[in-house]
């Protein structure tokens, strides 16, 4: 079972119209450059076999991967949105730094690894796709962690 108190984000993080709008604008801008619409990174398959109480921990892993392997390397693109959205997501990541689950998380890591593998396999277009799904990342964090 997750240590719930640490796998939580305050609702106020998702009620800031300006940064929410910038996050969604960034996602839209990137999705215009994504021509592989059949592949979804964040969706039903990511959550398959993961209980509701474990989903915030799962999304923490996805958030950290997105920041470190996608947003930081692509930080010069999609301005001015990127320079505002990355610090916002980094703050959420920092607030989830103590979110862990007790016991076996292999099923979670397996799902996250599939997402990572898909991004890596697609190369730069995988990174663009991940940026294009920042609205889904935002919603998933909101749904799982508040």
């Amino acid at each position: 079972a997750p240590i719930s108190s640490h796998c939580r984000l305050d609702k106020s993080n998702f009620q800031q119209p300006y940064i929410t709008n910038r996050t969604f604008m960034l996602a839209k801008e990137a999705s215009l450059a994504d021509n592989n619409t059949d592949v979804r990174l964040i969706g039903e398959k990511l959550f398959h076999g993961v209980s509701m109480s474990e989903r915030c921990y799962l999304m923490k892993q996805v958030l950290n991967f997105t920041l470190e392997e996608v947003l930081f390397p692509q930080s010069d693109r999609f301005q001015p949105y990127m320079q505002e959205v990355v610090p916002f997501l980094a703050r959420l990541s920092n607030r989830l730094s103590t979110c862990h689950i007790e016991g076996d998380d292999l099923h979670i890591q397996r799902n996250v690894q599939k997402l990572k593998d898909t991004v890596k396999k697609l190369g730069e277009s995988g990174e663009i796709k991940a940026i294009g799904e920042l609205d889904l990342l935002f919603m998933s964090l909101r749904n799982a962690c508040i």
Epitope: T20, F24, K28, D38, V39, R40, I42, G43, E44, K45, H48, D135, L136, M139
Partner: antibody
Framework: QVQLVESGAEVKKPGASVKVSCKAS????????ISWVRQAPGQGLEWMGW????????NYAQKFQGRVTMTTDTSTSTAYMELRSLRSDDTAVYYC????????????WGQGTLVTVSS | DIQMTQSPSTLSASIGDRVTITCRAS??????LAWYQQKPGKAPKLLIY???SLASGAPSRFSGSGSGTDFTLTISSLQPDDFATYYC?????????FGGGTKLEIK
């Protein structure tokens, strides 16, 4: 090309059941789900529920809970919607639509199946 | 359930007109809104998703805007093929819900 093809029109008596099929082609069936939407004559669109072609998980509108069953057959890339205990106000065109089920609009629709419930 | 209120329910316009249809959600739905066009006897067709993204194959004269609770569909210059019924739909929360529709008629 990507398409959804539904079964033909049905005429049923009140109290009977109907099972409508929706055959998908042109895409990976298990990468998406199927929503079912109905439209009574001269009326608007009404969402009935969704089924995942990947897991078989379902999400039904409360109005249809206990009366509708949605299933898929991945071997034939076909989705099914069964509605039981039919009433005259179930007379409608029933559409299937492609839908990932996670913040996704309906980008591909079937042609619709007219179900008429009449004694 | 999230209620979707479309206005007007009927709209008369002429070829070449700029037309706007509005849709209001009973609670915030971010940008999870789609617009569909339906012609008599046919299945609906996706025009706009994520409030403002143009669907594949949809003419560029269609555009969408808005976020939160208030949304608009705009047709920049009405063509003969555009006379149809238009529906908005929210896909932020289950159950998914549609607006009541706007019938666009020839003036």
């Amino acid at each position: 090309q990507v398409q959804l093809v539904e079964s033909g029109a049905e005429v049923k008596k009140p109290g009977a059941s109907v099972k409508v099929s929706c055959k998908a082609s042109g895409y990976t069936f298990t990468s998406y789900g199927i929503s079912w939407v109905r439209q009574a004559p001269g009326q608007g669109l009404e969402w009935m529920g969704w089924i995942s072609a990947y897991t078989g998980n379902t999400n039904y509108a409360q109005k249809f809970q206990g009366r509708v069953t949605m299933t898929t057959d991945t071997s034939t890339s076909t989705a099914y919607m069964e509605l039981r205990s039919l009433r005259s106000d179930d007379t409608a065109v029933y559409y299937c639509a492609r839908d990932r089920g996670y913040y996704d609009a309906f980008d591909i629709w079937g042609q619709g199946t007219l179900v008429t419930v009449s004694s | 359930d999230i209620q979707m209120t479309q206005s007007p329910s009927t709209l008369s316009a002429s070829i070449g007109d700029r037309v706007t249809i509005t849709c209001r959600a009973s609670e915030g739905i971010y940008h999870w809104l789609a617009w569909y066009q339906q012609k008599p006897g046919k299945a609906p067709k996706l025009l706009i998703y994520k409030a403002s993204s143009l669907a594949s194959g949809a003419p560029s004269r269609f555009s969408g805007s808005g976020s939160g609770t208030d949304f608009t569909l705009t047709i920049s210059s009405l063509q003969p093929d555009d006379f149809a019924t238009y529906y908005c739909q929210q896909y932020s929360n289950y159950p998914l819900t549609f607006g009541g529709g706007t019938k666009l008629e020839i003036k």
